[in-house]
């Protein structure tokens, strides 16, 4: 049966009895190696007469005395088979053995859970020599030993190539419990059930939980570890953390807060990046999201125009990057823009809104019904048309480019002409007789040129013919109108 | 760990009421479960009723229904056993007691109660 | 309400000896939500047993305590002199928390 030993108890005699060979309390030990900065197992040296094979934890040497006596099966004595002690003491245990002075070149080494200990752990052996016999004490100690010190110890001793166990010494390092889980922080929703999770561990077992919400016990009675602790519902935000309590004391978990789930605050700093004629690039700062990752934004546009019917232009975007191009705005028109954005919860209130204005643009229509006639008796052709309508000029009229494109004989020659906005007609003088001109009209602001209108053609006939009618914008649908005269 | 220190002895006369005190030590940012029982001369232990330290929540037993109130001072880690209506029969020694570890593992020392008139 | 009944009410006993101390409810308990007290003239009680049959902590293990349902049982293997006192039982799976009558182990 195992033994079992509390830290509270006295040393342990190194050995249960005296050793064969009667080894004397008052011996000094022939050889001592401490091992400090590596594992190096002790080794023996005794007369050279060969030991025998031999199979398992015993070896039973085949070699008999002068005598003909034969020699008692080598074996660990029995020693302490539990140690249970506390974090951060010191702990010290040994295994010894009597070998006989026939065996030559034993080693001993220390083995944990299976694994050979190398390195920097604080093992000694001792020899103590007698006629027949040598006694060995291998020693091993820790000075404050950790949990990772728990586990099955074991001595090793190898004789001419046999290996011979010692029963295994388990210690066991008690403390306070230890988290393998603690509880996370969460984002919940509004009265909905959900659940946290606690797992300590000793030794000594048993763990037991208990839950704090918000510096109140939650559980009367302690669960044993693990516990998962249902809450049925929360209606605001709350701390939660677990204590866990085992023979040696308490240990308490991190606090975790548990938030409840809102509509998000609306966003704020909505701020113009940049205006074109028929485009606002704007940008918000996203306010708090309520514990809910945002899911998209809505962008309001309304008209700043009084006299406008006051109808709101709603566009939709997703929640990232905090960054919307609005289109198909009138140029020159002033706009109130808010933003709301949406959780899972819901959307949240509009932003402060904020005024923003488009820029000129180039007319987004030609002039009107363009006309065109020669006058022969002072060799110009007019030209006269309809000024596009307000709404469709993006801007203040600064003017209008003419295009008239003579040719004749396959020669082709452009000329542009620039007129001011006053009026709705203007002359060219004829550049080529016998030529065909084809003229376009184009309204100009100062945001740029707007498109020029269909083309109008007529003929510019030798000197001498007669100006009968003139030629205009061609009906939808009717191409290249030419009037011979 | 955790203590419970209460409040002296007491001398009411019947018809009166008196308040016990229990203060508890050690690890006062917690407000645990809190439990009163009473002992009278020579008898058995009675328990009284519990107070939950969530929204400070009461069960009496219904032996004190109406005569008894337990409350909390956060402020100073105390809570009260007031019982009122006192008779002779409310002699007894009033434990407090609480659930640090396990069960009713701590006990304050006792205030004796004496109803004489 | 749960009535628990102790037997026997007084137990006389020498040191060295065993005590066994009965316990019964009038109904089962609650996830064996039962435990037992010592208490000594002028003090306080002191937890012993809880949940039926774990020990308290610094309890000595010559205390156990066995049983479920309606029937429990604290043992004491060996009396050692300072065990001479009053046990009481008391369950707590149900309001109100009620005690036994208590049981006086004196020496003998």
């Known amino acids: 049966a195992i033994t079992e030993a509390r830290e509270e108890a006295k040393p342990y005699p190194l050995f249960p009895g005296p050793f064969p060979g009667s080894l004397q309390t008052d011996h000094t030990p022939l050889l001592s190696l401490p091992h400090a900065s590596g594992y190096q197992p002790a080794l023996m040296f005794s007369p050279t007469q060969p030991g025998r094979p031999h199979t398992g934890n015993v070896a039973i040497p085949q070699v008999t005395s002068v005598e003909s006596k034969p020699l008692p099966p080598l074996a660990f004595k029995h020693t302490v088979g539990h140690i249970i002690l506390s974090e951060h003491k010191g702990v010290k245990f040994n295994c010894s053995i009597s070998v006989p002075n026939i065996y030559q070149d034993t080693t001993i080494s220390w083995w944990k859970d299976g694994k050979e200990l190398l390195g920097a752990h604080h093992a000694i052996t001792q020899f103590y020599p007698d006629d027949e016999v040598t006694a060995i004490i291998a020693s091993f100690s820790i000075t404050s030993v950790q949990r990772s010190d728990n586990g099955s110890y074991i001595c090793k001793m190898k004789i001419n190539n046999e290996e011979i166990v010692s029963d295994p010494i388990y210690i066991e390092v008690q403390g306070l419990p230890h988290f393998t889980k603690q509880p996370e922080s969460m984002n919940v929703t509004r009265n909905t059930a959900f659940n946290l999770t606690c797992q300590a561990v000793g030794p000594p077992e048993p763990v037991n939980i208990f839950w704090v919400q918000n510096s109140s016990r939650v559980n009367e009675q302690p669960e044993k570890s693990p516990s998962v602790l249902t809450v049925p519902g929360l209606t605001e935000m709350a701390v939660f953390s677990c204590e866990a309590h085992n023979d040696k004391g308490l240990t308490v978990s991190k606090g975790v807060q548990i938030n409840i789930k809102a509509i998000p605050s609306p966003p704020t700093e909505v701020s113009i990046r940049n205006s074109t004629a028929h485009s606002i690039l704007i940008s918000w700062v996203p306010g708090f999201d309520g514990y809910s990752p945002f899911r998209n934004c809505s962008i309001q546009v309304k008209e700043a125009d009084p006299l406008s019917n006051g109808s709101v232009m709603i566009f939709n975007t997703s929640a990232l990057p905090h960054l919307y191009q609005i289109k198909q705005l009138q140029a020159l028109a002033n706009y109130s823009i808010g933003v709301s954005c949406m959780n899972e919860i819901g959307w949240s209130a509009v932003s402060p809104w904020i005024l923003a204005s488009t820029t000129e643009g180039a007319p987004s229509v030609a002039p009107l019904n363009v006309t065109v006639f020669l006058n022969e008796s002072s060799d110009n052709v007019d030209i006269r048309w309809m000024k596009p309508p307000t709404k469709q000029q993006d801007g203040e009229l600064v003017g209008y480019r003419i295009s008239h494109v003579w040719q004749s004989a396959g020669i082709s020659k452009e000329l542009l002409e620039e007129v001011g906005q006053n009026g709705s007609r203007a002359r060219i003088s004829v550049q080529v007789h016998n030529a065909t001109c084809t003229v376009r009209i184009a309204a100009v602001t100062r945001g740029g040129v707007g498109p020029f209108s269909d083309p109008v053609k007529i003929f510019i006939p030798a000197h001498g013919w007669v100006d009968y009618a003139p030629s205009s914008t061609p009906a939808p649908g009717n191409a290249d109108p030419v009037l011979i005269i | 760990q955790v203590q419970l220190v209460q409040s002296g002895a007491e001398v009411k006369k019947p018809g009166a009421s008196v308040k016990v005190s229990c203060k508890t030590s050690g690890n006062t940012q917690i407000r645990y479960y809190m439990y009163w029982v009473r002992q009278a001369p020579g008898q058995g232990l009675e328990w009284m009723g519990i107070?939950?330290?969530?929204?400070?929540?009461?069960t009496y037993a219904q032996k004190f229904q109406g005569r008894v109130t337990m409350t909390r001072d956060t402020s100073t880690s105390t809570v009260y056993m007031e019982l009122s209506s006192l008779r002779s029969e409310d002699t007894a020694v009033y434990y407090c007691?609480?659930?640090?570890?396990?069960?009713?593992?701590?006990w304050g020392q006792g205030t004796t109660v004496t109803v004489s008139s | 309400e749960i009535v628990l009944t102790q037997s026997p009410g007084t137990l006389s006993l020498s040191p060295g000896e065993r005590a066994t101390l009965s316990c019964r409810a009038s109904q089962s308990v609650r996830s064996n939500y039962l435990a037992w007290y010592q208490q000594k003239p002028g003090q306080a009680p002191r937890l012993l047993i809880y949940?039926?049959?774990s020990r308290a902590t610094g309890i000595p293990d010559r205390f156990s305590g066995s049983g479920s349902g309606t029937d429990f049982t604290l043992t004491i293997s060996r009396l050692e002199p300072e065990d001479f006192a009053v046990y009481y039982c008391q369950q707590y799976g149900s309001s109100p928390r009620t005690f036994g009558q208590g049981t006086k182990v004196e020496i003998k």
């Open positions: 007691a609480t659930t640090y570890r396990y069960y009713m593992d701590v």
């Open positions: 107070l939950n330290p969530n929204q400070d929540q009461t």
């Open positions: 949940g039926a049959s």
